[in-house]
């Protein structure tokens, strides 16, 4: 999947398997990813679990778990608030699309959670305070967490320079992964730009991203997860400034 | 091994009035450099380990970003703390606890918020 | 919980071979350089060698340089120990253990070379 | 290499009474950015060892305060304050500063 991290930085992640997203004292939010297709390096997000720890007066320990094709509006004991302490309320799960759109609210740490379901595969967004970001009693155990410190290099697609090759070539190879041998030859480079342009008019890495998706999938349920994404962070980003983030001239090889 | 705590101080560091990417301020090359001297100071116990070269390519990634040179002044951290997780013994019958927003304008201006998102393939 | 699991000691002919693994448990072990250290019977800890979180490098003390290898597959969450030319100074209880230098230690496992 | 020489060897304590092993460094155990990088480990009898002090001084989770770790260069000191029944053991100390890494021979603490 793509990940933005708590620093903007933007990478493309072939993470395989349970990754922990977020881990600190108050939260824990783990995500497990597939391959999209079978031989293809690229994976996206199959389930997502969410960890709200015990805290104090406000909230009981919750656990949210979403899959393809179940994205409930209630934690897995079936509640929607924080249990049955005095500030309860300060934890609450809200179904805005069903089946498709859930919102968490955890006014008590000042985080919001935003959980789609996009075509087959799950989205994430979170809003969360850097003091709460950096709640960390165990860094060695705690503090290696994707959001924080982004996905690690043998794990990074160089998808800018496989957009660029594309761009030139036409070529629908993925750069640092192996082929995806079953993804529909009949999706060119140029619908791909057509199909992306129209929901992303911004030629930013979110774009870039979608038309990556398309190319390596030929699915095009990948343009709506870019543009659901940007608007997350459109709702979610304290820094209006930071919302596109753009191809970097001077960069790290295998860094987006 | 220690390098989280230099990403933990470094976050303090640059915990001012906007986020720390936007922030292209002699102030944040020098908690970059910090951020860079403290990461060499574990490299021994460290050096095997992802959190480490994560921060060395990240440090190079925000010096070449923020034009800061390598050479310059270095900064002290700001700490802040937040209330424990967990059950804490002081307990409070007021729900102002229970809203982050709140209990933070006691102690400070409005939070620094950061954003993290998963999507595609 | 972190938890260190070694395998694959026993008796071995001076100039055999065999193979340990240290399956890994509890934390992500894709993140951690990992080290070997052996215990003779009897005797006080030598450390064996290191390897990094992603195999980029491995480090080695002279007594075993060119016959032993480590190395790791995080897909699996398991550490390995090939050991070759088996001296009967090599007769130790080999212990894995995670970090770059050792925190969390396994409950070890005996190598004896004798003939 | 580096040489980790511990005193004493053996160390027989009384119960409640505090304990203090030695370990001398063969060369400067800090490098070049002022990072110093030695460790204690104890190993109870029919055990693993286990982290105590980790950089000099700082105490690993969950290893009870009455164990302190100090010194700098060459010299350093594993404190026990109020030696208790499970502290029975071998204590070793380890230097990270250098390749190849290395222990020191070990203190056997027993309890008088």
């Known amino acids: 999947p793509h990940l933005r991290t708590f620093t903007d930085r933007f990478q493309t992640c072939k993470v395989q398997g349970a990754w922990p997203l977020i881990d600190n004292n108050y939260l824990n939010v783990q995500v497990t990813n597939t391959p999209v297709l079978p031989g293809s390096a690229a994976t996206a997000t199959s389930k997502l679990t969410i960890i709200f720890k015990n805290f104090q007066e406000c909230v009981d320990q919750k656990v949210y778990q979403a899959e393809m094709d179940e994205l409930p509006a209630a934690f897995v004991d079936g509640s929607k608030n924080g249990g049955d302490k005095h500030g309860a309320n300060s934890l609450k799960i809200t179904e805005k699309v069903s089946g498709q759109h859930v919102e968490i609210q955890a006014k008590y740490i000042g985080t919001t959670i935003v959980v789609r379901q996009v075509g087959r595969y799950l989205t994430f967004a979170v809003r969360m305070p850097e003091e709460v970001v950096n709640a960390v009693e165990d860094w060695d155990s705690q503090g290696l967490y994707l959001c924080l410190r982004g996905c690690p290099l043998n794990q990074q697609i160089d998808f800018q320079a496989f957009h660029t090759n594309a761009e030139g070539t036409g070529a629908r190879r993925l750069a640092a992964a192996s082929p995806a041998p079953t993804a529909p030859e009949t999706f060119p480079y140029e619908t791909a730009v057509a199909k992306c342009k129209e929901k992303l008019p911004v030629e930013d890495l979110y774009y870039q991203a979608c038309v990556f998706d398309l190319l390596t999938t030929g699915d095009v349920n990948f343009t709506l997860a870019a543009y659901y994404a940007l608007e997350d962070v459109k709702m979610l980003h304290s820094n209006k400034d930071k919302l596109h983030l753009y191809e970097r001239t001077r960069d790290l090889p295998g860094r987006a | 091994c220690k390098i989280l705590k230099c990403n933990s101080e470094f976050w303090s560091a640059t915990s001012g009035s906007h986020a720390p990417a936007s922030d292209d301020t002699p102030e944040f090359c020098a908690a970059l450099r910090s951020y860079a001297l403290c990461t060499r100071r574990t490299a021994r116990t460290c050096r095997g380990d992802l959190a480490y070269h994560s921060a060395v390519h990240g440090i190079e990634d925000l010096m070449s970003q923020h034009n800061c040179s390598k050479d310059g002044p270095t900064s002290q951290p700001r700490l802040r703390t937040l209330p424990p997780a967990g059950d804490s013994q002081e307990r409070s019958d007021s729900p102002e606890i229970c809203h982050y927003e709140k209990s933070f304008h006691k102690h400070s201006a409005t939070p620094n918020y950061t954003h993290c998102g998963l999507f595609g393939d | 919980e972190v938890q260190l699991v070694e395998s694959g000691g026993g008796l071995v002919q001076p100039g055999g071979s065999l193979r340990l693994s240290c399956a890994a448990s509890?934390?992500?072990?894709?993140?951690?350089?990992m080290n070997w250290i052996r215990q003779a019977p009897g005797k006080g800890l030598e450390w064996i060698g290191m390897?990094?979180?992603?195999?980029?490098?491995?480090h080695y003390a002279d007594s075993v340089k060119g016959r032993f290898t480590i190395s790791r597959d995080n897909s699996k969450n398991t550490l390995y120990l090939q050991m070759n030319s088996l001296r009967a100074e090599d007769t130790a209880v080999y212990y894995c253990?995670?970090?770059?230098?050792?925190?969390?230690w396994g409950q070890g496992t005996m190598v004896t070379v004798s003939s | 290499d580096v040489v980790l020489t511990q005193s004493p060897l053996s160390l027989p304590v009384t119960l409640g009474q505090p304990a203090s092993i030695s370990c001398r460094s063969s060369?400067?155990?800090?490098?070049?950015?002022?990072?110093?990088?030695l460790e204690w480990f104890q190993q109870r009898p029919g055990q693993s060892p286990r982290l105590l002090i980790y950089?000099?001084?700082s105490r690993f989770s969950g290893v009870p305060d009455r164990f302190s770790g100090s010194g700098s260069g060459t010299d350093f000191t594993l404190k026990i304050s109020r030696v208790e029944a499970e502290d029975v053991g071998v204590y070793y100390c380890?230097?990270?500063?250098?390749?190849?890494?290395?222990f020191g021979q070990g203190t056997k603490l027993e309890i008088k």
């Open positions: 950089d000099v001084s």
């Open positions: 509890g934390f992500t072990f894709s993140y951690y350089g």
């Open positions: 060369q400067s155990l800090e490098d070049s950015d002022g990072g110093t990088f």
């Open positions: 380890f230097q990270a500063t250098h390749d190849p890494l290395t």
């Open positions: 390897i990094y979180y992603d195999s980029s490098e491995k």
């Open positions: 253990a995670k970090g770059t230098t050792p925190d969390y």
